[in-house]
Interface confidence: low
């Protein structure tokens, strides 16, 4: 669910959203660190219905979600796979 990408491409995100996306609507999250041609960190959320949203890295909800996913990925707990975007 949580993926970090280093890419030679420039910034991917033209517009960022801070609107909350429930986790069960999310297929995976890409984190593009600052550098490699882009001056800012980018977070790309891939929804289960195949749409893609760029999320503001400063949005509190995405920071909390990533922290939860990091903790779970470092433990034995499986991370739920949300295949459909529903509450």
């Amino acid at each position: 669910v949580l993926e970090v990408y280093y890419t030679s491409l420039r910034c991917r995100c033209v517009q960022e959203s801070s609107v909350f996306i429930p986790r069960r609507f999310i297929d995976r999250i890409q984190i593009l660190p600052r550098g490699n041609g882009c001056p800012r960190k980018e977070i790309i959320v891939w929804k289960k219905n195949k749409s893609i949203v760029c999320v503001d890295p400063q949005a509190e909800w995405i920071q909390r979600m990533m922290e939860v996913l990091r903790k779970r990925s470092s433990s034995t707990l499986p991370v739920p796979v949300f295949k459909r975007k529903i509450p």
Partner: antibody
């Protein structure tokens, strides 16, 4: 005050297409980070989630019924629709629409319509 | 699909009794479980969301517990107005409901 009201044909014949409407007020689907779902309940007790549409217009379906379902909303942001093709007697049920309000850490089905009864019969 | 197994399907208890209803998920759903009450002829009403959070306006005699695959709804002191059917709902992956528990007063 959030209210939802379902409407439909009441009775229709097998193999036809069922069209349902959910009319709502008290919230804006397009701006409130909300999701409207369709759920049905057969004559027993079971509840079955069918489909949903969210504030961005994204659509979601129950995988087991996906090929027969189409969910949509109107541009005036006061109605959500569900179409079920090739209906069968097994589609006889009470159909509910429900709104899910998204909060920072969860999403909850927090308001339901009263439901509309649909009978499929020849 | 995640399957929710709810038990018992029928429950008869006395006013004042402590009542428990169980839901078991076919796989780990973490805390993504809600409980609903449905009275005859009415739409379901949310009681508990995300395992143990009491929905606004719901009496404190209702509580929820559990995690992972096993969850419980508890009514600490059964009241006549609690006669209804109770459903669990998992919202970890898509949405699936339990089969319901019909609660009556004996």
């Amino acid at each position: 005050h959030v209210t939802l009201r379902e409407s439909g044909p009441g009775v229709l014949q097998p193999s036809k297409t069922l069209s349902l409407t959910c009319s709502f007020s008290g919230f804006s689907l397009s701006t409130s980070a909300m999701v409207v779902s369709w759920i049905r309940q057969s004559s027993g007790m079971s509840l079955e989630w069918l489909a949903a549409i969210d504030w961005e217009g994204d659509k979601y379906y129950n995988p087991s019924l996906e090929s027969r379902l189409t969910v949509s909303r109107d541009i005036s942001d006061t109605q959500v629709f569900l179409r079920i093709t090739s209906v069968d007697v097994a589609d006889t049920a009470t159909y509910y629409c429900a709104v899910m309000s998204s909060a920072d850490s969860h999403s909850v089905l927090d308001a339901w319509g009263q439901g509309v009864s649909v009978t499929v019969s020849s | 699909d995640i399957k929710m197994t709810q038990s018992p399907s029928f429950l008869s208890a006395s006013v004042g009794d402590r009542v428990t209803i169980n839901c078991k998920a076919s796989q780990n759903i973490h805390n993504y479980l809600n409980w609903y009450q449905q009275k005859f002829g009415e739409a379901p009403r949310l009681l508990i969301y995300n395992t143990n959070n009491l929905q606004t306006g719901i009496p404190s005699r209702f509580s929820g517990s559990g995690s992972g695959t096993d969850f419980t709804l508890t009514i600490s002191s059964l009241q006549p107005e609690d006669v209804a059917t109770y459903f669990c709902l998992q919202h970890s992956s898509s949405l699936t409901f339990g089969s319901g528990t019909k609660l009556e007063i004996n």
